[in-house]
């Protein structure tokens, strides 16, 4: 785990998300359905799988959620773009880690992310994107809990 650090400013991402959270969640047309929120799977991820699950969830947001989401409000769009950009850099940092064979993907890790993709696929694409954005705090909290995130001075 120590060799798989994410060098980015989590505080900045969380701040950006808090500014748009209410507006995003207000657009959620399926409040009783969840994509990440009830995932006990995320809570029982072993330290060995943290890097892989993080990598897969970053890919989920970068390659699916941020591509599927259509945001008409320029102010909110700027914030989402900023979060997406930070995720992209985190993804590249973890890819570097994976290149050095420090990011193993075991079956448990693959299963955990498959559940998220399955949940996403059960909703219409724009509704799924909105819901996943609204649940970003779940992912951010999980990263904070499971990673030694480096806050540079």
């Amino acid at each position: 785990l120590r060799r798989c650090l994410i060098s980015t400013d989590m505080h900045h991402i969380e701040e950006s998300f808090q500014e748009i959270k209410r507006a995003i969640q207000a657009k959620d047309t399926f409040p009783n359905v969840t994509i990440l929120s009830t995932l006990e799977t995320l809570q029982i991820i072993k330290p060995l799988d943290v890097c892989c699950v993080t990598k897969n969830l970053l890919a989920f947001y970068v390659d699916r959620v941020f591509k599927d989401h259509q945001e008409p409000n320029p102010k909110i769009l700027r914030k989402i773009s900023s979060i997406a950009n930070s995720f992209l850099y985190m993804q590249k940092t973890l890819r570097q880690c994976q290149e050095q064979r420090q990011c193993h993907c075991r079956q448990e890790a693959t299963n955990a992310t498959r559940v998220i993709h399955d949940n996403y696929d059960q909703l219409e694409v724009h509704a799924a994107a909105i819901k996943s954005l609204g649940e970003l705090d779940v992912f951010l909290a999980w990263i904070n809990k499971n990673h030694e995130v480096m806050f540079s001075a």
């Epitope: 060098s7 980015t8 400013d9 941020f66 769009l77 773009s81 950009n85 590249k92």
Partner: antibody, heavy 122, light 107 residues
Amino acid sequence: QVQLVQSGAEVKKPGASVKVSCKASGYTFTGYYLHWVRQAPGQGLEWMGWINPNSGGTNYAQKFQGRVTMTRDTSISTAYMELSRLRSDDTAVYYCARDIVVLPPAIGFDYWGQGTLVTVSS
Amino acid sequence: AIQLTQSPSSLSASVGDRVTITCRASQDIRSDFGWYQQKPGKAPKLLIYAASSLQSGVPSRFSGSGSGTDFTLTISSLQPEDFATYYCLQDYNYPWTFGQGTKVEIK
């Protein structure tokens, strides 16, 4: 309008250090990653690394690891690139460049400084 | 490090010509790729990002295509201001690397 203004040309002796500055204006400095790219005379472009002005986090190309230090001063919206133990083959134009922020996310250097020529000669 | 091989290294063309420059990566880089134009004594200019997205303000005669290992920059109708050196960049893996450049000259 967005501008990246770099410090002036430098002449250094081998073994010395150089610190190039890049002053940003016309946008929120902490909202965009900044990269450093160099170009030796008559040669191609070479990526050196990036700094996240918001956190100060960095990532350097392996080639420059241990010799390069990228820092920033958010109070004056300025990024710095210091290269130590200079050699003659470090003679190049050094550019700072801002990364785009788009959706879906992607990398692209949309604004560049004018370049700083660093000459290393005994 | 991932190597990018541009071809040709130089070409001569006339105004109005259709010009194609290719860049081959030494391994799969998905679409983490861009094209830049540089004129003598000037900083590079972003043309294409994410392999095929046209940067704002860049004329539509420029287009990018490809993914994986093979990428192409096409100028549909070469204009006098397009004579320059073109570089590709991969940002899939650190260290990010540029191609060696393709110089487009007037025939």
